[in-house]
């Protein structure tokens, strides 16, 4: 949320859109006449990356000078200034900062506590005054039975044989975000949530280790949902619907085991958890949870540097990384991403000033803060400049947590980036086994949806900007994230080949940047959404009979999907027929491509009430998965199915898809209006 200072002091994003060549980067004597080709650029990038010591930078960013660096703290700010200075040293076209005043939640001087009490509320004993906390928890005291709900997924709650209403729920960390666990528990009228790391999933020797997280089912400052708090907008006080109304607290494994000692019932064997795990507190005992966290307003800084494009400076790819971290552990969470951001910025600055690389489009390097509170810095920037970013920012590349292991290369992205990612995976070799990252022609089916706790999520789901996040990681979660053990030493112990792994991540990101800013035709595969739409229609088709019973038809949805398919085919034909050297024509065609993601944002919901408007990847009743979930209820439990809602969902989903098809078609006279 942003407070606007005097105008002359405020650097607006729009300034990055100027084309004044005097502001572009200084270059040494480099041949400017010949355009570098993809093969040359790839080799150039690879050579540049070979000469960089990534691990040293990560180590430097993980040391006491910059830790701990909670958002808005002095050390967070000093790192921000360091990054800003680095960007200046790289002689970027423009370097600027974005200042926001956001509400974050911190621990109070009064300790949070977990206590076992008897049925009369009398103290049996103190289990723990936890060292960690969960930001945006409700500050409250609750007492009740404790029920284990595994990871706290919707299915986990469905599989329980005991209701959780009026009870405190204990869940394992992992699988889904803290916020989702809490939202699932709250939806079933649980009164509080405890989260712990079991030894099976998080093999940490220290059972007393505390950890941090946040419980906002959303991103950005939850007290300015869907909008930035510019002081002249005069929005009344507001509160995100994603904030929990129940207290939530992280506890150590040792505390969880103390609780299990007062509990009964075997945890199911298919949970594959610790043998100490138990299901419910004994009938004579209750658990009392007290959370007394407090809200604080903090000034936060996002730092930006731009390399302006030489042909289309008003079109930009954004590359970003989280700078902050809750607690003392910073290495895997934010030092890797920030180090990578700095080194990529240096490499690209170098390629332009020394080697003649001339990106057509601009590259914005962004250092976000308050990421640990739910991508606050990134979201506030998006909220503040939503209209400026539309049809300008065309891809976001997230560098957070890119190296957590070596075994797997995992991708989460907009379908528009699948084809490009596939090509890059074929090009880039894994540093350990020397084989290409492309292991499986079926890799797209393994792509995981971007989650709420990923900074790429608001780009895609809130702003409709194609986004990608990737990581080298293990099947198991990296155990130290959110703990004080997230140190450089722990990371190098887990990933001995850290330097090579980060270098490879840099190669993936670097190739993405080059392909997206260099090629005349925008490397976004709009045809990928055909299979997404087909998959949705197939899922819906299973319920043909139900839809017919309601007197509804899928004909219009088929028609909208068909129009989208025809529009993509027509655009492909147009690209094929276009003269690649005709910049004007190519820009018009690329603009049509840039509309695709944005037009999957439902125009029928308010960004304030439902900020994540994307019908595929967003959150809320307007999404296609929500439509299917609602329809499923008709078969399972007629009482829970909402027919009025479904009728709306189907009509609006159909028209959103039709709108996306129309936008892709181009001009209004090109649109097939038989609909």
């Amino acid at each position: 949320c942003k407070r606007v200072e005097q105008k002359e002091e405020c650097v607006k994003l729009a300034e990055t859109e100027e084309t004044d060549k005097s502001e572009t980067m200084e270059t040494e004597d480099v041949p400017t006449s010949s355009r570098l080709y993809w093969a040359d650029l790839k080799t150039l990038l690879s050579e540049k990356l070979n000469s960089i010591e990534f691990a040293d930078t990560i180590k430097q960013l993980s040391q006491n000078t910059y830790t701990p660096r909670e958002a808005g703290s002095q050390k967070d700010e000093s790192l921000a200034y360091y990054i800003e200075n680095q960007f200046h040293e790289f002689k970027f076209s423009k370097v600027w900062r974005d200042e926001h005043y956001v509400k974050i939640q911190v621990k109070d001087s009064a300790q949070n506590s977990v206590i076992i009490v008897d049925k009369n509320g009398r103290l049996v004993y103190l289990v723990e005054n936890p060292g960690g906390y969960v930001a945006y928890s409700k500050a409250a005291t609750v007492t009740g039975k404790l029920v284990h709900a595994n990871f706290g997924t919707k299915k986990d709650f469905e599989d329980l044989y005991t209701p959780v209403n009026g009870s405190i729920v204990i869940v394992r960390a992992g699988k889904i975000t803290f916020a989702e666990k809490v939202a699932n528990a709250e939806s079933l009228n649980a009164i509080g949530v405890l989260i712990y790391m079991d030894q099976t999933k998080f093999p940490i020797v220290n059972a007393e280790l505390s950890f941090f997280g946040h419980a906002h089912l959303g991103t950005g400052d939850p007290y300015t949902p869907g909008f930035p708090s510019f002081n002249h907008t005069q929005f009344p006080p507001s509160r995100s619907s994603g904030l929990p109304n129940i207290p939530v607290q992280t506890i150590s494994r040792a505390a969880a085991e103390k609780l299990f000692g007062n509990m009964e019932g075997d945890c199911p064997s298919d949970w594959k958890t610790d043998s100490t795990c138990r299901m419910v507190t004994s009938e004579s005992k209750n658990v009392k949870l007290t959370v007394s966290n407090v809200l604080k307003e903090r000034r936060i800084l996002n730092i930006f540097g731009v390399i302006k494009g030489y042909e289309e400076p008003d079109r930009y790819v954004v590359v970003g990384a989280q700078r902050d971290a809750l607690g003392a552990g910073v290495a895997a969470k934010s030092s890797v991403g920030t180090g990578l951001l700095l080194k990529l910025a240096q490499v690209f600055s170098d390629m332009i000033s020394k080697d003649g690389f001339r990106p057509s489009r601009s590259i914005i390097f962004a250092s976000w803060t308050a990421g640990d509170f739910g991508a606050v810095g990134a979201t506030e920037w998006l909220e503040g400049y939503l209209s400026s970013l539309h049809l300008k920012a065309f891809t976001y590349i997230n560098l957070d947590k890119v190296v957590l292991g070596t075994s797997n290369f995992k991708v989460s992205a907009s379908p528009l980036l699948y084809t490009l990612m596939g090509k890059i995976m074929q090009d880039v070799k894994h540093p350990v086994d020397g084989k290409s990252l492309y292991r499986d022609s079926n890799w797209i089916s393994k792509v995981e949806k971007l989650s709420f706790d990923n900074a790429a999520y608001p780009f895609l789901a809130y702003s409709g900007i194609p986004a990608v996040s990737f990581c080298f990681c293990e099947d198991a979660d990296y155990p130290y994230l959110g703990t004080r053990l997230d140190t450089y030493e722990a990371l190098t112990q887990k990933v001995p080949q850290l330097n090579q792994m980060v270098r490879t991540a840099a190669e993936v990101a670097g190739q993405l940047i080059i392909k997206l800013t260099h090629d005349v035709e925008l490397n976004l595969d709009y045809e990928r959404y055909n299979s997404q739409l087909l998959s949705f229609v197939r899922d819906l088709n299973q319920y043909r009979a139900d839809i017919k019973e309601m007197g509804l038809s899928l004909q219009w949805l088929y028609s909208a999907r068909g129009d989208f398919f025809r529009a993509t085919s027509r655009l492909t034909t147009d690209f094929g027929n276009a003269e690649k050297t005709d910049r004007f024509v190519m820009k018009k065609l690329n603009d049509r491509v840039m509309r695709v993601e944005y037009h999957f944002l439902s125009p029928y919901v308010s960004p304030k009430e439902s900020p994540f408007r994307h019908v595929f990847w967003g959150s809320g009743s307007h999404t296609l998965p929500a439509l299917l979930e609602n329809l499923k209820l008709r078969k399972q439990n007629n009482g829970a199915f909402n027919e009025t809602l479904f009728r709306n969902q189907l009509a609006l989903a159909t028209w959103t898809i039709q709108g996306a098809a129309n936008a892709l078609s181009g001009d209004v006279w090109d649109i097939d209006n038989e609909f």
Epitope: Y161, E264, G265, D266, C267, V280, E283
Partner: antibody, heavy 122, light 109 residues
């Protein structure tokens, strides 16, 4: 309808063995602890053994410890009681019972079978 | 082990009368862990009260439980013909064994 049906009772000589089964239906068997309770002819109820929902924790009355083994097969919704080294004082009607609350082992028993008779006599 | 002693052994009453059955424990029992059962000849026991005072599903409100520590009571406010049976108390809160009282027979006077 929640139902428990015991089987396997009969006449056995002292020192002999017998295996009782209890088939459960109408509820989520794997979520509940189960118990065996017996009643000697003309006498009161005697708790024999209890087993937690996943089979991880078992408890026995002193009078049967080391001779009886309680077990369950959650995939078959069946509870078992393996009785070895039987004595004349083990003669009784054996009831299988379900705990009231899911997961609780320390719980009242809200559903009972009709019982199966075990007679130990030479 | 906790020994539960029920009194009286037999209670002779007429339909419509109030029945008060007592269960005394040899050591303190958490009220969360005391139950009462009814058993009729040739039938399995039936849960009436759990947690000392909570009525099980489908149990008429003429049955009520009370007490704490070592003294617990089952009260039948107005005896109906179908209430004549043997009543057992059970504790299930301590470490095993989980014991039953010897029973109180409520018979028609």
């Amino acid at each position: 309808e929640v139902q428990l049906v015991e089987s396997g009772g009969g006449l056995v000589q002292p020192g002999g063995s017998l295996s009782l089964s209890c088939a459960a239906s109408g509820f989520s068997f794997k979520g509940y602890s189960m118990s065996w309770v017996r009643q000697a002819p003309g006498k009161g109820l005697e708790w024999v053994s209890s087993l937690s929902n996943g089979g991880g924790s078992s408890y026995y009355a002193d009078s049967v410890k080391g001779r009886f083994t309680i077990s369950r097969d959650n995939s078959k919704n069946t509870l078992y009681l393996q009785m070895n080294s039987l004595r004349a004082e083990d003669t009784a009607v054996y009831y299988c019972a379900k705990t009231l609350g899911a997961y609780y082992i320390k719980s009242a028993m809200d559903v009972w079978g009709q019982g199966t008779t075990v007679t130990v006599s030479s | 082990e906790i020994v539960l002693t029920q009194s009286p052994g037999t209670l002779s009453l007429s339909p419509g009368e109030r029945a008060t059955l007592s269960c005394r424990a040899s050591q303190s029992v958490s009220s969360s862990y005391l139950a009462w059962y009814q058993q009729k000849p040739g039938q399995a026991p039936r849960l009436l009260i759990y947690g000392a005072s909570s009525r099980a599903t489908g149990i008429p409100d003429r049955f009520s439980g009370s007490g704490s520590g070592t003294d617990f009571t089952l009260t039948i406010s107005r005896l109906e013909p179908e209430d004549f049976a043997v009543y057992y108390c059970q504790q299930y809160g301590s470490s095993p064994p989980w014991t039953f009282g010897q029973g109180t027979k409520v018979e028609i006077k």
